[in-house]
Interface confidence: medium
Amino acid sequence: LEVQVPEDPVVALVGTDATLCCSFSPEPGFSLAQLNLIWQLTDTKQLVHSFAEGQDQGSAYANRTALFPDLLAQGNASLRLQRVRVADEGSFTCFVSIRDFGSAAVSLQVAAPYSKPSMTLEPNKDLRPGDTVTITCSSYQGYPEAEVFWQDGQGVPLTGNVTTSQMANEQGLFDVHSILRVVLGANGTYSCLVRNPVLQQDAHSSVTITPQRSPTGAVEVQVPEDPVVALVGTDATLRCSFSPEPGFSLAQLNLIWQLTDTKQLVHSFTEGRDQGSAYANRTALFPDLLAQGNASLRLQRVRVADEGSFTCFVSIRDFGSAAVSLQVAAPYSKPSMTLEPNKDLRPGDTVTITCSSYRGYPEAEVFWQDGQGVPLTGNVTTSQMANEQGLFDVHSVLRVVLGANGTYSCLVRNPVLQQDAHGSVTITGQPMTFPPEA
């Protein structure tokens, strides 16, 4: 019995759902009563999910797996793994038995994008040319381990005096801290780039240091210049900090987070107490860090509707405020490709190829190209529809006249995540049937 799985690893983002594709070719007269299907972890042989005696036997893997019951009779034995975790990474084997046995293993590669790095300076005031400063670049909750690069304002790599550490949290996600020690010139820009090697996602931040006194008077409130990018469903930290003076106590602090445009209250701290969330009970401060001047806000289970500007107001004796932007994003699924017609194709036939990718944000950019990488722009129609959560489903249709044979690729790009999802189909100019997508 021939069991087919994808050759390449399936890449899944932490917290999203992944489909481990597996298919077999049912013979005429096949009935589900004959099917025995087992999914297991390849290495430990731990049972993940099974189907037997005409019935789905259910998940044996943290109740996070499901089959596609309506597709089993057509030979689709794929497994849906929900709310992917780092610990799920590895090889899964699909065993199919009807009269004969067959099996194949598919690899799951888990990934999580790194947050936009936050940059801190030590010391951070009264800096003069010739002073030695320590610049720390911190990026959070990524997987797998990152590659970190430093460069100056001219793009010249800085390799000396760099120390990088990566620590995994309980979920297996890495927090990266990279420290650069430099001697200040008249002024200078220092950039840190954190790369996710699997997603080919780069997160970067820079700091420009002008060695001179910072103005006194009002409370200086610092937030990141660039938008904070957060994936739908994950938690985001809107960073905000102030410099407490010696003898500062939380009883003196008034902190308010609000939506910049509508001034709607989000969270507040006053009279030495956290006054709690006024924003769908999805916000929290970092109480243990407030006394050190960390007024950051944690926004849980980010939604598309959260996108926008948040203002952090700090009052001790004086007032100060600053606004930080939240950019929400969701990766697009690997495109599925369909052909119409999909049988008995001959050179000269006109076919419609549809490329569909789901549940991304913001709107995608779609590109078509042929097997030689030449862009195909004519006869392309792309539509994008937002669902109730504000996530977009993309459908792009290409009409082509078949040559002797040809490959047609569709690339769906998320402009914020710089994430490319692509699918392709190869059509040979002879009578053929397009295989069903797993």
Partner: antibody
Framework: EVQLVQSGAEVKKPGSSVKVSCKAS????????MHWVRQAPGQGLEWIGL????????NYNEMFKNRATLTVDRSTSTAYMELSSLRSEDTAVYYC??????????WGQGTTVTVSS | DIVMTQSPLSLPVTPGEPASISCRSS???????????LRWYLQKPGQSPQLLIY???NRFSGVPDRFSGSGSGTDFTLKISRVEAEDVGVYYC?????????FGGGTKVEIK
């Protein structure tokens, strides 16, 4: 001594808007939250929402979210509550009340708003 | 929304005698910061409400010590140890743990 002095009584037609003011004195206006509460004739008290004068942060009772607008003028230490699309059920005494986000200690004398055609 | 239920609706009292008003909430009033934001107000005839008790049992400044508050979670009580003629009016309990903040329906205290 803390004082909250509200504007005078208003008579309005259905569908129109009303703007009630509340001038504060005797404390640092910018540092405390201002709440608005109303009381229909012979009825209990109903919380409309609150505003923080310094940041302008607001939090509304969902029941009033689309019709009530809370604002402040820090230069005159005055808070305002505007209610639009008035209907007869909005006939009530409207109070401002100053305090923290989770409480209100001091109340204005109240402003009677009558909605009648 | 949190529903605040007061009893009795009306309370005829004799000066010098004690009085007690009950207030029950439809959900616990313990805030995430562990405080309980339950208050008692008195509205005298023709006046604005005035604060008597905050955070269940704390007397506001200037409030006579004959007024006391108690309770926890969802059940709260206001007691007047010896009623005086000036104590007449409508008493309201109020919660500000959950948005929207809500009030009880009021208890009218009058001299017999």
């Amino acid at each position: 001594e803390v004082q909250l002095v509200q504007s005078g009584a208003e008579v309005k037609k259905p569908g129109s808007s009303v703007k009630v003011s509340c001038k504060a004195s005797g404390y640092t206006f910018s540092s405390y939250w201002m709440h608005w509460v109303r009381q229909a004739p012979g009825q209990g008290l109903e919380w409309i929402g609150l505003i923080h004068p310094w940041s302008g942060s607001t939090n509304y009772n969902e029941m009033f979210k689309n019709r009530a607008t809370l604002t402040v003028d820090r230069s005159t230490s005055t808070a305002y509550m505007e209610l639009s699309s008035l209907r007869s059920e909005d006939t009530a005494v409207y109070y401002c009340a100053g305090g923290g986000r989770l409480y209100f200690d001091y109340w204005g004398q109240g402003t009677t708003v009558t909605v009648s055609s | 929304d949190i529903v605040m239920t007061q009893s009795p609706l009306s309370l005829p009292v004799t000066p010098g005698e004690p009085a007690s008003i009950s207030c029950r909430s439809s959900q616990s009033l313990v805030h995430s910061n562990q405080d309980t934001y339950l208050r008692w107000y008195l509205q005298k005839p023709g006046q604005s409400p005035q604060l008597l008790i905050y955070k269940v049992s704390n007397r506001f400044s200037g409030v006579p010590d004959r007024f006391s508050g108690s309770g926890s979670g969802t059940d709260f009580t206001l007691k007047i140890s010896r009623v005086e003629a000036e104590d007449v009016g409508v008493y309201y309990c109020s919660q500000s743990t959950h948005v929207p903040y809500t009030f009880g329906g009021g208890t009218k205290v009058e001299i017999k």
